[in-house]
Amino acid sequence: HTAAQDNCTCPTNKMTVCSPDGPGGRCQCRALGSGMAVDCSTLTSKCLLLKARMSAPKNARTLVRPSEHALVDNDGLYDPDCDPEGRFKARQCNQTSVCWCVNSVGVRRTDKGDLSLRCDELVRTHHILIDLRHRPTAGAFNHSDLDAELRRLFRERYRLHPKFVAAVHYEQPTIQIELRQNTSQKAAGDVDIGDAAYYFERDIKGESLFQGRGGLDLRVRGEPLQVERTLIYYLDEIPPKFSMKRLTA
């Protein structure tokens, strides 16, 4: 009888089923929905998390202007197809044979088509801009304190290497967090910026994916940082391909 058997849960993903049937009675966890093995020492991929969710019952101080190629996730939730490593498959289709191409964070990057649509490769999202607006406070937060707290959060809670947090911008009440991670920069074992951003997004919404941890309690020098609006922009290594009709709509 081991400690693993006493507490056989996945600290980094509560959307799992775990049982102590691994080597030496160790805890082995599988994601809901897909049944895929989950590494509980790190973040679970966004694709597996979305699949689990669908299976469950219901430096300059100036702000960044997202580029014309930035994507926002307007399509919302869908039941994705994940590859054997838990990443999004480049082509996603729904039950009515409508298909589209997605990037590495699962956001649609082409017009919708039929089963003949081809998505040759999974295009990497290398730059994520998280745009937050905080609730009114007595005064503005100190920028360097805010910067340090958000960097600490991504390092400690989401295990994202500090080099991938490119910048934190602040103009009260807007905070922007820039995450950058090129294919060449991401080493084996590195948390993906898309996964970190998704965990952060769920935390901000009060829907923490961590097992048994309290919700996110963000404080800057003891002052609560309460977010009232979140927008996330995704920039891909190859610009998306939408028809002019969509761009002018």
Partner: nanobody, 121 residues
């Protein structure tokens, strides 16, 4: 790119033996923990046996303990599973997997396509 290629499966009578091999490439095999897992028809993946990177520690599922032996040759980047006294319930697709073991948790992150083992008279 991680690649795992199993071989050695086949049809064998109850009580018989087989030796499976798994050729690994695309990652530093000599520093990777490895496992054998199996999937019986219509069932989920079942962990069978585990070996650490230098071969000094092994574990076996209760269902195969005393009958199966896991080993590895790091100079050849190859993992082995010697299966003796085979039973009908051992019939499954056998896959080798790269694994990770901590004090409390176990996970596999890459699997081969598998080799079929059928035990029947």
């Amino acid at each position: 790119q991680v690649q795992l290629q199993e071989s050695g499966g086949g049809l064998v009578q109850p009580g018989g033996s087989l030796r499976l091999s798994c050729a690994a490439s695309g990652f530093p095999f000599s520093s990777a923990d490895m496992s054998w897992v199996r999937q019986a028809p219509g069932k989920g993946l079942e962990w069978v046996s585990y070996i650490n990177a230098d071969g000094s520690k092994t574990y076996y599922a209760d269902t195969v303990k005393g009958r199966f032996t896991i080993s590895r040759d790091n100079s050849k980047n190859t993992l082995y599973l010697q299966m003796n006294n085979l039973r009908a319930e051992d019939t499954a697709v056998y896959r080798c997997a790269r694994a990770k073991l901590t004090d409390t948790h176990y996970v596999e992150d890459y699997w081969g396509q598998g080799t079929m083992v059928t035990v029947s008279s």
